[in-house]
Each structure stands twice: as structure tokens, then as C-alpha cells.
């Protein structure tokens, strides 16, 4: 007996071939011997089966001795043994229809769990193997669970259902609701304008929710809310903003914040949260601000940075076109009685300059 696997909602074509290439009498019946379709004279006729309104055939192949039965909009309960009667012989085809669906909405927040459930006919014992867009493989039986979704799990999941050495493939689109980056750091010289951007890793027709940026300044003992905003159909409106600093926010996506001036007292780290309508949980993105200041006071040239820097970052003071350099893995460096000229303060990571500030030292007579 031939086994054919089908997908719920899909179309399947069951083939039946006569030994001779000619148009002849044929009938398709189910396991209860109820006629589904067949030939009468030259034309297709349908029987009393509940399947009949979804069954069809290809008349153009009858004179080739091919008497297929097409079943559209497959249902799990269509799983059955179908019998094709042609030329005094019977061909049996076992049709097994499977369905694979996500238990919840397919738009899930990062960290939430995804459960896929397999619908299968009674008596079948299928196995399921799913592959995420990032290449992660998960196996299961009637259910498949992904406990903690990551942003790289966004996209088309390909799931293969196997039964009796036959396979059928399902594609399920999953959207992980997250920001493009988990964390980002902005490096600025004192006084410069600061731009914070929070691009989303997904697109939705209608995007509605509310958000807030909490800020923990390095110099402050506690964090404070810098701004709260609403999002309605991808339009941003500010609800409340602190007086110091007075942040500005873009009206369109991606979420965009502007700090008029980078000052040492603002250096620190923030957490932007976004709660989406009809979703439990929030999206998060961490943002860090590192501020540099180079100053000359009497005989002392100092370069300082404020904000979250890793211990492996190097801070250097270097006289332009000269070899004179002082470097430290610290948050401040200085030179006593610096030579006259243009000095550069550099914050670097393994040779890559993250931030630089120039200061001119004038000769003292």
C-alpha cells in the first residue's frame, strides 16, 4: 500500500495508473466503500462522500491511463485509505494529513517561549524536526518547545514531519519582538550633541505601545526617568521629559533621542523599555554614554572619561607629531608641564580609537 502525507489546508494529488494508455472506467472510494468520484461516459461524476465537493481529477490525463484524485483544503479527518478501482484491479493509497500550528501568537517577545503543536490522525506515530532561521535544530513528538526565544530566531522555521519513511514540510513564520541591539555605547566629547537610536528588529503593520528611558548617571546615587512616551500606529509622542537634561525625541520610528550636550554628569547607562499593546512583557535596550573632557589647568594637562568603560580600554595623551605619549588603562591621564603644541586625548580599544579630543597647549614664557 502506498503512503502519501498531506498538509492540513493544502491540496494533495493521489495517483492511479491503468496498465494501458487509454480512457477507461475508474472509481475512487474511501475505506467504507463510499464512492468519491469516477467516470460516467466521458465525464467526471461525484459520489455521496463528504469529500466529494473538495475532490477533483485531471481529465486531460485520462487517455494516458492516469486517473488521479485531487483533494483540496485537506482536513485531518481526510486521513484514510483510498481505493482506486480501474481495469478490474484495486490500488490502495493511505493518506495521512498533518497540521502544525503555533500555540500562541507567532509574534513573541524575546525571552518568551514558543510551542508548536502537531495535529495528526489517530494511530499515527510521527516525529517532528524543526530548524530555526539561525540553524538551531529541535526535535519532538506531538509538541515542540523553544523555551527562550532569541532575536536570531525571527524568520521562517522549517519543520519536517516524518511518518513511514515519508516526510512533509511545514514553514512557520515567527517574529521575535526585540530591538536590533541588546546594548549600544555612544562615545562623545564634552559639549557635543548626543544621538541615541533604538531600531527595532521587526516591522508590524500597526505598532502601538508606550515606553520609558531610565538613566543611571555614574555620579548619581539612584536612577531616574529621563523620558516617557507613547507610540500610536508608529507615531511617537512624548508624555513626560525631565528638565535636566531636556531630551528631544523623534516623531517617527526608529525611536530616536537627542541629548543637546554631552556633560560628565550625564555619563552613565540607561535602559529603554517598550511595552507593546496586547503583549505581555517589555522590549529592552541598554544604552551607555561615555563622555571625554581634556583640560589644562596651570602646569597640568588632564584627560578624563566618565561613564561605563571596560578595564581593557586605554586612555592616552599624545603630542601631535612627537613621540611624547602617556597611556593608562584608567579613566584619567595627565601630563605635568606639557610641551607646547596640539595634544590628543585618545580612548582606544585594542588600537581602535573610540573617542578623541584635541587640546592646544600654548607656551608659557
Amino acid at each position: 500500500k502506498k503512503v502519501v502525507l498531506g498538509k492540513k489546508g493544502d491540496t494533495v494529488e493521489l495517483t492511479c495508473n491503468a496498465s494501458q494508455k487509454k480512457n477507461t472506467q475508474f472509481h475512487w472510494k474511501n475505506s467504507n466503500q463510499i464512492k468519491i468520484l469516477g467516470i460516467q461516459g466521458l465525464f467526471l461524476t461525484k459520489g455521496p462522500s463528504k469529500l466529494s465537493d473538495r475532490a477533483d481529477s485531471r481529465k486531460s490525463l485520462w487517455d494516458q491511463g492516469c486517473f488521479s484524485m485531487i483533494i483540496k483544503n485537506l482536513k485531518i479527518e481526510d486521513s484514510d485509505t483510498y481505493i482506486c478501482e480501474v481495469e478490474n484491479k484495486k490500488e490502495e493509497v493511505e493518506l495521512l494529513v498533518f497540521g502544525l500550528t503555533a500555540n500562541s501568537d507567532t509574534h513573541l517577545l524575546e525571552g518568551q517561549s514558543l510551542t508548536l503543536t502537531l495535529e495528526s490522525p489517530p494511530g499515527s506515530s510521527p516525529s517532528v524536526k524543526c530548524r530555526s532561521p539561525g540553524g538551531k535544530n529541535i526535535q519532538g513528538g506531538r509538541t515542540i518547545s523553544v523555551p527562550q526565544l532569541e532575536r536570531q530566531d525571527s524568520g521562517t522555521w522549517t519543520c519536517t514531519v516524518s511518518q513511514d519513511q515519508k516526510t512533509v514540510e511545514f514553514k512557520i513564520d515567527i517574529v521575535v519582538l526585540a530591538f536590533q541591539k541588546a546594548s549600544s555605547t555612544v562615545y562623545k566629547k564634552e559639549g557635543e550633541q548626543v544621538e541615541f537610536s533604538f531600531p527595532l528588529a521587526f516591522t508590524l503593520e500597526k505598532l502601538t505601545g508606550s515606553g520609558e528611558l531610565w538613566w543611571q548617571a555614574e555620579r548619581a546615587s539612584s536612577s531616574k526617568s529621563w523620558i516617557t512616551f507613547d507610540l500610536k500606529n508608529k507615531e511617537v509622542s512624548v508624555k513626560r521629559v525631565t528638565q535636566d537634561p531636556k531630551l528631544q525625541m523623534g516623531k517617527k520610528l526608529p525611536l530616536h533621542l537627542t541629548l543637546p550636550q554631552a556633560l560628565p554628569q550625564y555619563a552613565g547607562s540607561g535602559n529603554l523599555t517598550l511595552a507593546l499593546e496586547a503583549k505581555t512583557g517589555k522590549l529592552h535596550q541598554e544604552v551607555n554614554l561615555v563622555v571625554m573632557r581634556a583640560t589644562q589647568f596651570q602646569e597640568n594637562l588632564t584627560c578624563e572619561v566618565w561613564g561605563p568603560t571596560s578595564p581593557k580600554l586605554t586612555l592616552s595623551l599624545k603630542l601631535e607629531n612627537k613621540g611624547a605619549t602617556v597611556s593608562k588603562q584608567a579613566k584619567a591621564v595627565w601630563v605635568l608641564n606639557p610641551e607646547a603644541g596640539m595634544w590628543q586625548c585618545l580612548l582606544s580599544d585594542s588600537g581602535q580609537v573610540l573617542l578623541e579630543s584635541n587640546i592646544k597647549v600654548v607656551p608659557t614664557w
Epitope: 494529488e13 465525464f43 467526471l44 485531471r58 486531460s60 485520462w62
Partner: antibody
Framework: EVQLLESGGGLVQPGGSLRLSCAAS????????MSWVRQAPGKGLEWVAS???????FYADSVKSRFTISRDNSKNTLYLEMNSLRAEDTAVFYC?????????????WGQGTTVTVSS | DIQMTQSPSSLSASVGDRVTITCRAS??????IAWYQQKPGKGPKLLIH???ILHPGVPSRFSGSGSGTDYTLTISSLQPEDFATYYC?????????FGQGTKLEIK
């Protein structure tokens, strides 16, 4: 001999309506699926809609909800009701018979009727 | 929906030439492809169905082949009456789609 004769084409303003007919003869009309196929000036063929022997209908995305295909087996006639017509619907509309059902190719075609949508 | 990409869009050839037209489907169409010939001001005529089955009355110089997504129509020795436009059609499902057409002209 299979014969298909389209009628009902003409000039219509954008947003207007038109009803095309196709008179069939020379075969057992009720036992065959039928289709409408169009061809814009200087362009290729585009399948528009089908109706099978049992009355099930199928439409191209470009005409869905604007066009309606129907048949009157007692009159051996196929129809295409076209509403909310647009300039891009300007074409020669062909009536065609399928070899059998809607899962078969079209084997006979009419000579076509011209529809012009213009203000 | 299944897309059909037909090539070339036009072709110049001489009487007696062997000509090949190809159609590529956006997914497997299980050999359910038909080929049509159309002459100016006329309705199309069926030449071949199910990849290689000749419609009654069609000359044997026309042949078809292919499987999966790639299909070809071959005219073994062009005759003057063969200069026309040719279309492929996929009928794997009722939402049938045509290729863009190949205009076969006299060189």
C-alpha cells in the same frame, strides 16, 4: 465543432461596470470548467477567472472582489461581471474551455472581445 | 502564486531551423505545463499539455520536455506557419499562470 463566441466588450469609464458573455456550442457545456483570459494591448496572456463544472470559482488576485465569473448551463453561456474598472483592465478578453476541470489546461478559445477603460 | 519566467522574449530564426523556448517555474509544477501558439488577432491554440503530450492535430515537429521547475518547447524544423508568439502555462493548481511569451520572427 467547439465554438466560443464572446460579446459585451466596449468603451467604459474608470469606475464603471461591464458584463461579458460567452456563448458556447459544439460540446456538453455543463461538463467542462470555463475560464476568462485577458490580453492587454501589446502584452502577454493573463488568466483572470475560472468556474468549474460544479460551480466553484477561482480568481486572479488582480481582479478578486471586482470581477465575478458565473455560468448558466441551461443557456450554454459563461459570464464575467466586471465592476470598479480601471485603465489597466483595458484588454482583449478571451473565453476558454478547459480540457475537463479547473485542474486541466484550456484547450479551446474564442476570438475575444475588446474592453477599453478610458475617460 | 506560481510565477512562470519564459525566455527568450523574442527570437529570430529561419525556415528549417531548430528552435527551443524555455519556461522556469517559481516552484515544482509536477510536469503540469501546457504550451500555446498565438497569431495576431486570434485566440491562442493548445499545442502541448502535461509537458510532452501533443494536442490532436498538432504537427510532430513540436515537442516538449522538462520536469520540476524547468521546461522546454522545441520546434525541430521551423515552417512558415510557425512564426507566431508562444506561451507556456502552468496548471499545477486552478490559479493558472502564463509565461510572458516568446515572439518568434523570421530572420
Amino acid at each position: 465543432e467547439v465554438q466560443l463566441l464572446e460579446s459585451g466588450g466596449g468603451l467604459v469609464q474608470p469606475g464603471g461596470s461591464l458584463r461579458l458573455s460567452c456563448a458556447a456550442s459544439g460540446f456538453s457545456f455543463s461538463n467542462y470548467a470555463m475560464s476568462w483570459v485577458r490580453q492587454a494591448p501589446g502584452k502577454g496572456l493573463e488568466w483572470v477567472a475560472s468556474i468549474n463544472e460544479w460551480g466553484s470559482t477561482f480568481y486572479a488576485d488582480s481582479v478578486k472582489s471586482r470581477f465575478t465569473i458565473s455560468r448558466d448551463n441551461s443557456k450554454n453561456t459563461l459570464y464575467l461581471e466586471m465592476n470598479s474598472l480601471r485603465a489597466e483592465d483595458t484588454a482583449v478578453f478571451y473565453c476558454s474551455r478547459h480540457y475537463g476541470g479547473s485542474y486541466d489546461p484550456m484547450d479551446y478559445w474564442g476570438q475575444g472581445t475588446t474592453v477599453t477603460v478610458s475617460s | 502564486d506560481i510565477q512562470m519566467t519564459q525566455s527568450p522574449s523574442s527570437l529570430s530564426a529561419s525556415v528549417g531551423d531548430r528552435v527551443t523556448i524555455t519556461c522556469r517555474a517559481s516552484q515544482d509544477i509536477n510536469k503540469y505545463i501546457a504550451w500555446y501558439q498565438q497569431k495576431p488577432g486570434k485566440g491562442p491554440k493548445l499545442l502541448i499539455h502535461y509537458t510532452s503530450i501533443l494536442h490532436p492535430g498538432v504537427p510532430s515537429r513540436f515537442s516538449g520536455s522538462g520536469s520540476g521547475t524547468d521546461y522546454t518547447l522545441t520546434i525541430s524544423s521551423l515552417q512558415p506557419e510557425d512564426f507566431a508568439t508562444y506561451y507556456c502555462l502552468q496548471y499545477d493548481n486552478p490559479l493558472q499562470t502564463f509565461g510572458q511569451g516568446t515572439k518568434l520572427e523570421i530572420k
